[in-house]
């Protein structure tokens, strides 16, 4: 019998290399059974995760999974950092792994680096 616990499918130590000025959607895949849980996004500040209030979020439904999406319209250099989604389910809080956004500010980059360059060397991006 399949578990009916809420599960959040963000991979541990995942990251996204993105450019300031571009739109970006950060997705939190959510698996649930009967009732869709309340889901929120927060941004890590040291060991504290600060809830993101008043941001554009939306839901996308696919066959076996729902996605709670945080919209960046557009990405700003200050969006660099680690994010986590959390689900409120049966009075319990289920937290995802954090995922990191490495933001390249194209104004300060002499030329737009390739995805491969950024993917293999994220330490070249904002720390």
């Amino acid at each position: 019998k399949e578990s009916c616990d809420v599960q959040l499918y963000i991979k541990r130590q995942s990251y996204h290399s993105i450019f300031a000025g571009d739109p970006f959607k950060l997705e939190c895949p959510v698996k649930y059974c009967a009732h869709r849980p309340q889901v929120t996004w927060c941004k890590l500040n040291g060991t504290t995760c600060v809830k993101l209030e008043g941001r554009h979020t939306s839901w996308k439904q696919e066959k076996n999974l729902s996605f709670f999406i945080l919209h960046f319209e557009p990405v700003l250099p200050s969006d660099n950092g680690s994010y986590r989604c959390s689900a409120n389910f049966l009075s319990a809080i289920i937290e995802s792994h954090s995922t990191t956004l490495y933001v390249t500010d194209v104004k300060s980059a002499s030329e737009r680096p390739s995805k491969d360059e950024m993917a293999s060397r994220p330490w070249l991006l904002y720390s």
């Epitope: 499918y9 991979k11 541990r12 293999s120």
Partner: antibody, heavy 119, light 112 residues
Framework: QVQLQESGPGLVKPSGTLSLTCAAS????????MYWVRQPPGKGLEWIGR????????RYNPSFKSRATISADKSKNQASLKLSSVTAADTAVYYC????????????WGQGTLVTVSS | DIQMTQSPSSLSASVGDRVTITCRSS???????????LNWLQQKPGKAPKRLIY???KLDSGVPSRFSGSGSGTDFTLTISSLQPEDFATYYC?????????FGQGTKLEIK
């Protein structure tokens, strides 16, 4: 169950490029991380790097500088390793491995393939 | 890089013995999620390594309960409560907390 099968030439010439492929079955690789580890004859294990097949993003061991390239093909459910400018010191058994990226619930290694660097 | 140091490097023991292998990391393996990503592998001659234990103490499916893992921070142990003939192998610890991933040098467990 999750299984991995490595393939590629067992002999590579010095200064050439080592190329290996790792085909996965029993799992959709987009839900995993795939990684490569090598083991020189009679020695210990050395982590080369890993890929997130969902988006192609990679992490490498700096000791391989820019010689290693890991890629993945979701449509074929496989990952590949290329190691350039090889020397005799790169002679080793090369293993690919795969693990659950979400909950670490499985970690499976391929059988390994011995690659000898020699002219 | 995190250095992983195992001791002993080799160990002779008899069937039925209780055996402990230790692994020390050069820095804490405690991740920001409060978990330590410390794994133990078993490797038999000519074979691929096989994960026995992950997250310090969780046993992989199919691994006999005579294997156990413990520890925190920088000090970890693998214990085999009663050695069986099939347990004679080389054991490696490795960390999955920071990049690059790093392995201990291995502990070869031999029959006395």
């Amino acid at each position: 169950q999750v299984q991995l099968q490595e393939s590629g030439p067992g002999l590579v010439k010095p200064s050439g490029t080592l190329s290996l492929t790792c085909a996965a079955s029993g799992v959709n690789i987009k839900d995993t991380y795939m990684y490569w580890v090598r083991q020189p004859p009679g020695k210990g294990l050395e982590w080369i790097g890993r890929i997130d097949p969902a988006n192609g993003y990679t992490r490498y061991n700096p000791s391989f500088k820019s010689r290693a390239t890991i890629s993945a093909d979701k449509s074929k459910n496989q990952a590949s390793l290329k190691l350039s400018s090889v020397t005799a010191a790169d002679t080793a058994v090369y293993y690919c491995a795969v693990y659950d990226g979400y909950y670490e619930s499985f970690d499976v290694w391929g059988q390994g393939t011995l690659v000898t660097v020699s002219s | 890089d995190i250095q992983m140091t195992q001791s002993p490097s080799s160990l002779s023991a008899s069937v039925g013995d209780r055996v402990t292998i230790t692994c020390r990391s050069s820095q804490s393996l405690l991740d920001s999620d409060g978990k330590s990503y410390l794994n133990w592998l078993q490797q038999k001659p000519g074979k691929a390594p096989k994960r026995l234990i992950y997250l310090v103490s969780k046993l992989d499916s199919g691994v006999p309960s005579r294997f156990s893992g413990s520890g925190s921070g920088t000090d970890f142990t693998l214990t085999i409560s009663s050695l069986q003939p099939e347990d004679f192998a080389t054991y490696y610890c490795w960390q999955g907390t920071l990049f690059p991933r790093t392995f201990g040098q291995g502990t070869k467990l031999e029959i006395k």
